[in-house]
Interface confidence: low
């Protein structure tokens, strides 16, 4: 058979035998001559081997490009392919020679010395046991042991070929420890050598590159890439690497097995690629491929080689970040840099350290932003190699959706007396300032009440307060602006001219950051009335009374309750006066009933009021006809006792005779102090020219005379003590003499 490349001008060498297959008997001499167009060489079975001297290759003598191969006393093992070829080419001619030796029909080749057959437990794989024959048409079977089993060619997946050996699906003999071929010639049995069966794995679980993803290096640095393959046991593995640079001299690859951990069912292989000093040409993709004979797995990474360190901010860096109060703020740092920069954050010039509210690093994270977090944040990047720095400032603006101050007051629903004038207010703080505050209303019965929800009132729709038809007459006053707790707040006031209808009022405030609303329950009753005696605001240690007055013809069962702190946890039911539904949960008070011609009056007396007596008091009265309970809530505030204080300055005054002097003594204290005026340490008494008003606070001297000049003292006293302030009145001018004659 001639073998050559298509279109090649070189003709294959010519052999002295015209046949592709030659059959000769053992102990005869094999001689084949080969002629060609250039230098020739011979290859024969089992070359090289110890008995090489048996094979002779000689020049022909009659031609330059001619060689004769001679093998004297051939044996069965000389069976195989004899190849004549042109040196340094693939152009050749081959003849297959069978040496028929009935005493040893199986050929033992060099590679059979070990007699090992490697197989995988793959259903689709076949294995060749290389028991080649010196006779082409033998009846060969395969014996496997232990247990003993014999396989004969079936014309399908099991076959014997004298040139290859015995082919069989590998799983059929995977149980066996050894196999051999057997042939029968003239009732004589011949056996090939024994082959040990080794079951090998092929599965590669994974191939991992370390470092993974992208590796960044400076020119001149050392690159070390580790490729680790995890396989099943009994696997042999080959590694190969693909890399950008064609200059291989500075690359070093070391492959080794890694000791598997005890108890693991995996084997580890490691291939390490090292470049001692990278250059720009080493930049690119590095692929590690692991091959187990049946399976290939690969992984890749990118090696970036920087010729010099650099640093720059990415184009996506923001200069302004707006956030809503309470939200999480993340200000990422986008940079292009090699190596990774040191990142430092500053706020208003001061370095920021990570704590439970702020985390600094590749991004600045503020867990729950508050208004005080607003300001200028500067991030400074430093390249650790070049020490180059870059800075960028981000302004953080914290927006506050409208916050309605009164919303925070958890107080029970107030009831308002029929026909009275009432004022409702919403104090709103928002940043940026409000777009608007709007007031809406709805009839109480048109809304539903679900106390468990954040917004307990659900009204299908809200009507603008301009439309108060069917409701209370309303007037919205012009917004006031006030500095409260250091913040500019907007105060919107709704004046209900006369309380006739039970309703819900809603103030809605909107700004850029969101909206806020407060729903105010306005429950109007014609029922009981609460009064405090005395009418002045009570001070601790004073005696006072709470009076609940109800029409005797309409109401009965007057009872006083105190709404304790436990009432907030009470389930308030569906009513719009939830406090009435939970009287059992309230603290019942003992009162005294008085009656006059039309009313019953239930009095709770406080002989020596204390701050503990403060709170919400509920008067409950039952409608005689309907048996429905009406409840009225009064918030009782007890003022703490305070010694008198003069809260302002008394200025000295200079005036002319006949003018009017006015002076105010500004005082504070609880109980309200008693004010006395002295002139030159003598008590001042009212007369036609001296007038004392507003509880003696205001002193007026009309048509002053020369003798009205002097040192005036204002003295404020209560049970806790006295406070004094002095002022000097200087009267200028000449007193006219009165002619009495």
């Amino acid at each position: 058979a001639s073998v050559g490349l298509p279109g090649d001008s070189l003709h294959p060498p010519k052999l002295s035998t015209q046949k592709d297959i030659l059959t000769i008997l053992a102990n005869t001499t094999l001689q084949i001559t080969c002629r060609g167009q250039r230098d020739l060489d011979w290859l024969w079975p089992n070359t090289p081997r110890d008995s090489e001297e048996r094979v002779l290759v000689t020049e022909c003598g009659d031609s330059i490009f001619c060689k004769t191969l001679t093998v004297p006393r051939v044996v069965g093992n000389d069976t195989g392919a004899y190849k004549c070829f042109y040196r340094d080419t693939d152009v050749s001619s081959i003849v297959y020679v069978y040496v028929q030796d009935h005493r040893s029909p199986f050929i033992a080749s060099v590679s059979d010395e070990h007699g090992i057959v490697y197989i995988t437990e793959n259903k689709n794989k076949t294995v060749v046991i290389p028991c080649r024959g010196s006779i082409s048409n033998l009846n060969v079977s395969l014996c496997a042991r232990y247990p003993e089993k014999r396989f004969v060619p079936d014309g399908n997946r099991i076959s014997w070929d004298s040139e290859k050996g015995f082919t069989i699906p590998s799983y059929m003999i995977s149980y066996a420890g050894m196999v051999f071929c057997e042939a029968k010639i003239n009732d004589e049995t011949y056996q090939s050598i024994m082959y040990i069966v080794l079951v090998v794995g092929y599965r590669i679980y994974d191939v991992v590159l370390s470092p993974p993803h992208e590796i960044e290096l400076s020119a001149g640095e050392k690159l070390v890439l580790n490729c680790t393959a995890r396989t099943e046991l009994n696997v042999g593995l080959d590694f190969s690497w693909q890399f950008p640079s064609s200059k291989h001299q500075h690359k070093k690859i070391v492959n080794r097995d890694v000791k598997s951990l005890p108890g693991t069912v995996a084997k580890m292989f490691l291939s390490t690629l090292t470049i001692d000093s990278v250059t720009k040409s080493d930049q690119g993709e590095y692929t590690c491929t692991a091959y187990s004979g049946l399976m290939t797995k690969k992984n890749k990474t990118f090696v970036r080689v920087h010729t010099k360190p650099f640093i720059a901010f990415g184009s996506g860096m923001k200069s302004l970040v707006e956030a809503t109060v309470g939200s999480q703020v993340r200000i990422p740092v986008k940079y292009l840099s090699y190596p990774a920069p040191d990142i430092k954050w500053y706020r208003n010039g001061r370095p920021i350290e990570s704590n439970y509210t702020m985390i600094v690093g590749d991004e600045l994270t503020i867990m729950e932003v508050s208004e005080r977090d607003a300001g200028n944040y500067t991030v400074i990047l430093t390249n650790p190699i070049s020490m180059e720095k870059q800075s960028h400032m981000v302004s953080l603006v914290v927006n506050v959706p409208p916050q309605i101050g009164e919303k925070a007051l958890i107080s029970p629903m107030d009831s308002y007396q029929y026909g009275t004038m009432q004022t409702l207010t919403c104090t709103v703080y928002a940043n940026p300032p409000l777009h608007h505050i709007q007031w809406y209303w709805q009839l109480e019965e048109a809304c539903s009440y679900r106390p468990s929800q954040t917004n307990p009132y659900t009204c299908k729709e809200w009507r603008h307060v301009k439309d108060f038809q069917g409701g209370n007459k309303i007037e919205v006053t012009k917004n006031q602006y006030a500095l409260i707790e250091g913040k500019n707040k907007t105060v919107s006031t709704l004046v209900i001219q006369a309380a006739y209808v039970s309703a819900l009022y809603k103030c809605e405030a909107i700004n850029k950051a969101g909206r806020g609303e407060r729903v105010i329950s306005f429950h109007v009753i014609r029922g009981p009335e609460i009064t405090v005696q005395p009418a002045t605001q009570p001070t601790e240690r004073e005696s006072m009374s709470l009076l609940c007055t109800a029409d005797r013809n309409t109401f009965e069962n007057l009872t006083w309750y105190k709404l304790g702190s436990q009432a907030t946890s009470v389930h308030m039911g569906e009513s719009l006066t939830p406090v009435c539904k939970n009287l059992d949960a309230l603290w019942k008070l003992n009162g005294t009933v008085f009656s006059n011609s039309t009313n019953d009056i239930l009095i709770v007396a406080f002989q020596n009021a204390s701050l503990q007596d403060q709170g919400n008091y509920v008067c409950s009265a039952q409608d005689k006809k309907t048996k429905k309970r009406h409840c009225l809530v009064k918030q009782l505030v007890i003022l703490e006792r305070m010694a008198p204080m003069i809260t302002g300055n008394l200025e000295n005054q200079t005036t002319t005779i006949g003018e009017t002097i006015e002076v105010v003594c500004p005082t504070s204290g609880n109980p309200t102090p008693l004010i006395t005026w002295f002139k030159d340490n003598e008590t001042l008494v009212e007369d036609s020219g001296i007038v004392l008003k507003d509880g003696n606070r205001n002193l007026t001297i009309r048509r002053v005379r020369k003798e009205d000049g002097g040192l005036y003292t204002c003295q404020a006293c209560n049970v806790l003590g006295c406070a004094r302030a002095e002022t000097l009145f200087i009267i200028e001018g000449v007193q006219e003499k009165t002619n009495l004659e």
């Epitope: 777009h435 709007q438 929800q453 299908k460 729709e461 009507r463 603008h464 909107i510």
Partner: antibody, heavy 115, light 108 residues
Framework: EVQLLESGGGLVQPGGSLRLSCAAS????????MGWVRQAPGKGLEWVSS????????NYADSVKGRFTISRDNSKNTLYLQMNSLRAEDTAVYYC????????WGQGTLVTVSS | DIQMTQSPGTLSLSPGEGATLSCRAS???????FGWYQQKPGQAPRLLIY???SRATGIPDRFSGSGSGTDFTLTISRLEPEDSAVYYC?????????FGGGTKVEIK
């Protein structure tokens, strides 16, 4: 009786503009949030925009943000929708509706964007 | 943004039967801000249920709404021929306001 009547729809080329109006009667217009909802042929409802009673605050769907402007004239009891840079996908019946709960709707006006 | 998903897409029932329509929100919605609408061919939608369970003015009591959080249901207790329509759910708890894709109710 509450009535909402839309007008201003029609055929317009892509990139063109159109202004829709909604005349309201039978209720106090200035008390209510008003909105526009659209419905492409054979499709479901899609909210477009809402405006507060005073006109001080507005909301838009992302699909129309920057192209459509909602406004109102409380003295004329009229709601408007100015539609610019119209696209084929804006083709729909545009409804005007009252309140957050959209308790009353107009009969709609058809806007066709086609070349 | 909150997505509203309605099921089934179509419901084919006989007069007198009961119908249950479901609406699921991608995140929790306050029931106060949830409604159901009915739209008949060639007509504008009309409000049926507001606040998840309150019937709008003039809506027959065979229509009822329930649910909270992310799952809401519209129940029509005894179907009548005039109930043939597309029913939409809607939320305005968070902007943008959003509708479900609709459930078509056919009367056999």
């Amino acid at each position: 009786e509450v009535q909402l009547l839309e007008s201003g729809g029609g055929l317009v080329q892509p990139g063109g503009s159109l202004r829709l109006s909604c005349a309201a009667s039978g209720f106090t217009f200035s008390w209510y949030v008003m909105g526009w909802v659209r419905q492409a042929p054979g499709k479901g409802l899609e909210w477009v925009s809402s405006i507060y009673p005073s006109g001080g605050a507005t909301n838009y769907a992302d699909s129309v943000k920057g192209r459509f402007t909602i406004s109102r004239d409380n003295s004329k009891n009229t709601l408007y929708l100015q539609m610019n840079s119209l696209r084929a996908e804006d083709t729909a019946v545009y409804y005007c509706a009252r309140g957050n709960y959209l308790d009353y709707w107009g009969q709609g006006t058809l806007v066709t964007v086609s070349s | 943004d909150i997505q509203m998903t309605q099921s089934p897409g179509t419901l084919s029932l006989s007069p007198g039967e009961g119908a249950t329509l479901s609406c699921r929100a991608s995140q929790s919605v306050s029931s106060n801000y949830f409604g159901w609408y009915q739209q008949k061919p060639g007509q504008a939608p009309r409000l049926l249920i507001y606040g998840a369970s309150s019937r709008a003015t003039g809506i027959p009591d065979r229509f009822s709404g329930s649910g909270s959080g992310t799952d809401f249901t519209l129940t029509i207790s005894r179907l009548e021929p005039e109930d043939s329509a597309v029913y939409y759910c809607q939320q305005f708890d968070s902007s943008p306001l959003s509708f479900g894709g609709g459930t078509k109710v056919e009367i056999k």
